[in-house]
Interface confidence: low
């Protein structure tokens, strides 16, 4: 349905600084298909680690940590002429404010690693 003409756009300067949010997520099962095993098959494999914070929504976020400094070659050996680096994504989370058991949250930016990729290392030539 079209937006009510009286409602400010979320980018509008008149948009309220404080809003009510329904935490019942729509399309919750959109990504419920079996997790891929790219983390194991990648030439820059990673492990997933649980980042838990009871003062945040969502309280649990899974983050990737590269297994090696180098990349895995076709024979399964780590090649240190290449580098495994994390792919980082800035996300928005809700931070409880003030802390402990209130229903008041503030948006907060968070940088998370979602996987790793193999890159050519930066070579600094000393003059």
């Amino acid at each position: 349905s079209p937006q009510n003409p009286g409602c400010p756009n979320a980018e509008d300067k008149n948009f309220p600084r404080t809003v009510m949010v329904n935490l019942n997520i729509r399309n919750r099962n959109t990504n419920s298909k079996r997790a891929s095993d790219y983390y194991n098959r990648s030439s820059s494999p990673w492990n997933l680690h649980r980042n838990e914070d009871p003062e945040r929504y969502p309280s649990v976020i899974w983050e990737a940590k590269c297994r090696h400094l180098g990349c895995v070659d076709a024979d399964g050996n780590v090649d240190y002429h290449m580098n495994s680096v994390p792919i980082q994504q800035e996300i928005l989370v809700l931070r409880r404010e003030p802390r402990h058991c209130t229903n008041s949250f503030r948006l907060e930016k968070m940088l998370v690693s979602v996987g790793c990729t193999c890159v050519t290392p930066i070579v600094r030539h000393v003059a």
């Epitope: 914070d53 009871p54 003062e55 983050e63 990737a64 940590k65 590269c66 680096v85």
Partner: nanobody, 122 residues
Framework: EVQLVESGGGLVQPGGSLRLSCAAS??????MGWLRQAPGKEREFVAA????????YYADSVKGRFTISRDNSKNTLYLQMNSLRPEDTAVYYC?????????????????WGQGTLVTVSS
């Protein structure tokens, strides 16, 4: 803003033990780590621990000798250092970080304590 205060440093003989503590005020559910800086050297990663305390990571040079732990109820991070060597001599810092990617990169740590000096010498 998180404030971090380290304690427990001092002079110890080779082979001895020390336990460092880091008292945190403010938000402390982030991952945390211990890093050190020896005279004339760059800061280097020692150990890190996840916010929940479930995951721990160590530099190869301290693996099997040092143990990182945390007590979230006391907002305190610990580093138990055993079998200390002269090359462990450094100022030890605790610091926070947003996650456990690239734990060995000292530039990825956000809040730093003032440091506590550990000297290993006979």
């Amino acid at each position: 803003e998180v404030q971090l205060v380290e304690s427990g440093g001092g002079l110890v003989q080779p082979g001895g033990s020390l336990r460092l503590s880091c008292a945190a005020s403010g938000r402390t559910y982030d991952a945390m780590g211990w890093l050190r800086q020896a005279p004339g050297k760059e800061r280097e990663f020692v150990a890190a621990i996840s916010g929940s305390g479930d995951d721990t990571y160590y530099a190869d040079s301290v693996k099997g000798r040092f143990t990182i732990s945390r007590d979230n109820s006391k907002n305190t991070l610990y580093l138990q250092m055993n079998s200390l060597r002269p090359e462990d001599t450094a100022v030890y810092y605790c610091a926070t970080r947003r996650g456990l990617y690239y734990v060995w990169d000292a530039n990825d740590y956000e809040n730093w304590g003032q440091g506590t000096l550990v000297t290993v010498s006979s």
